[in-house]
């Protein structure tokens, strides 16, 4: 969480941003809130990015003002116009690109004063893993697959029964480049699996951590998946 104070003579307002991550090819949110004003026409929101010549987005007098917008963001940005009046300056970024990563500034002017806060935005690819029993294998085998990751993650297997055990000798992980030549499909196979145990396939890079669990008993198979973004810090 980053909280910025703007000082304009005696007038300052608090602006708060939250560091976040964008999943490339999908839509992302750059989060920013501020002390609201009673008049929408008095609020100016400007989003900037370090190293970019033009603005990322500008909203003033109740509407978008995009004459100074940088071409790399053209047609890809929007604020939540109906929420600006209550202090939401968050930016929706469509079709997140790898190059969207970097330092952003949310800059706010209201009748009360001005303020700004920076936001670190990471970009990559992350997806939920699915763990299945590989019935085609010669021995009891589990197969963990996740369709899109970038940068290349690490994959670690764990088990509820053998806590702390190192499964690197009995597992094999491969990364297959997807058709867009950036993201990769992650496939990890775990051999010599025992029944009545819960196994976890943990995939992690510097942006996200995802876990796929599978519980195999003689009568049923239970699965559960979980994904967590790693860098959600507020400013």
């Amino acid at each position: 969480l980053i909280i910025g104070f703007g000082i304009s003579g005696r007038h300052s307002i608090t602006v708060t941003t939250v560091a976040s991550a964008g999943n490339i090819g999908e839509d992302g949110i750059l989060s920013c809130t501020f002390e609201p004003d009673i008049k929408l026409s008095d609020i100016v929101i400007q989003w900037l990015k370090e190293g970019v010549l033009g603005l990322v987005h500008e909203f003033k007098e109740g509407k978008d003002e995009l004459s100074e917008q940088d071409e790399m963001f053209r047609g890809r940005t929007a604020v939540f116009a109906d929420q600006v009046i209550v202090g939401n300056a968050s930016l929706r970024l469509k079709n997140v690109q790898l190059t969207d990563a970097g330092t952003y500034k949310c800059y706010i002017i209201t009748s009360k004063g001005k303020g700004n806060a920076n936001l670190e935005y990471k970009t990559g690819a992350f997806s939920m893993p699915e763990v299945n029993v590989d019935y085609n294998a010669s021995s009891e085998t589990l197969r963990c697959e996740a369709p899109r990751w970038f940068p290349q993650p690490t994959v670690v297997w764990a088990s509820q029964v053998d806590q702390g055990a190192n499964f690197s000798e009995v597992s094999n992980t491969s990364f297959e480049l997807n058709s867009e030549n950036v993201t990769m499909k992650v496939v990890s196979v775990l051999y010599n699996v025992t029944i009545n145990n819960t196994y976890s396939c943990m995939i992690e890079n510097d942006i996200a951590k995802a876990t796929g669990d599978i519980k195999v008993t003689e009568s049923e198979i239970k699965r559960r998946s979980h994904l967590q973004l790693l860098n959600s810090k507020a400013s």
Partner: antibody, heavy 120, light 107 residues
Framework: EVQLLESGGGLVQPGGSLRLSCAAS????????MSWVRQAPGKGLEWVSA????????SYADSVKGRFTISRDNSKNTLYLQMNSLRAEDTAVYYC?????????????WGQGTMVTVSS | DIQMTQSPSTLSASVGDRVTITCRAS??????LAWYQQKPGKAPKLLIY???SLESGVPSRFSGSGSGTEFTLTISSLQPDDFATYYC?????????FGGGTKVEIK
């Protein structure tokens, strides 16, 4: 220490060419846009050109458009200004400058300048 | 292009004086304004950004105010080191433009 160091200035005849360099140190060069600003003898400051951190986007003053080209090599932490078809009115001290989000895109770091003289 | 007009072009003052320099933009630039100090043979030095924010390391006798089209730089008590030329500059749009400068000289 954050530093910008220009080089490549000198005496050139009208119609000639010159390439200025600006070596950056002390900061992550590729993260920042960069600009060239010039100052004719006894005159004020004039912005010349800017380039984005990636090098993919550029902007020029009308007075140099079509004659000057700004570029950068992020692997060498160096900014360039290729000046062609030089005129007497291009005579100036040329500064490279770094704008920053921290200073709302004002130029917080400047080089010491390099003198370009266009004369026959 | 946004034109930046500074006044006066020359200002004679004494140590201890309160000095005010004005900068006017040809269209609204919100608070996208910076002030620089330049001494002969040296590169400009950033004093004020965002119209009123003091750059780190700059003495507090320097202050900036204004928004929209009218801006001022004030030196509350002129010191010997302050005799120099001062420029305003807009960062609202390209091309970036500077004011013509104000030379503060000893009376």
């Amino acid at each position: 220490e954050v530093q910008l160091l220009e080089s490549g200035g000198g005496l050139v005849q009208p119609g000639g060419s010159l390439r200025l360099s600006c070596a950056a140190s002390g900061f992550t060069f590729s993260s920042y846009a960069m600009s060239w600003v010039r100052q004719a003898p006894g005159k004020g400051l004039e912005w010349v050109s800017a380039i984005s951190g990636s090098g993919g986007s550029t902007s020029y003053a009308d007075s140099v458009k079509g004659r000057f080209t700004i570029s950068r090599d992020n692997s060498k932490n160096t900014l360039y200004l290729q000046m062609n078809s030089l005129r007497a009115e291009d005579t100036a001290v040329y500064y490279c400058a770094k704008p920053s989000l921290a200073t709302m895109l004002a130029f917080d770091i400047w080089g010491q300048g390099t003198m370009v003289t266009v004369s026959s | 292009d946004i034109q930046m007009t500074q006044s006066p072009s020359t200002l004679s003052a004494s140590v201890g004086d309160r000095v005010t320099i004005t900068c006017r933009a040809s269209q609204s630039i919100s608070s996208w304004l910076a002030w620089y100090q330049q001494k002969p043979g040296k590169a400009p030095k950033l004093l004020i950004y965002d119209a009123s924010s003091l750059e780190s390391g700059v003495p507090s006798r320097f202050s900036g105010s204004g928004s929209g089209t009218e801006f001022t730089l004030t030196i509350s008590s002129l010191q010997p080191d302050d005799f120099a030329t001062y420029y305003c500059q807009q960062s609202k749009s390209y091309p970036r433009t500077f004011g013509g400068g104000t030379k503060v000289e000893i009376k």
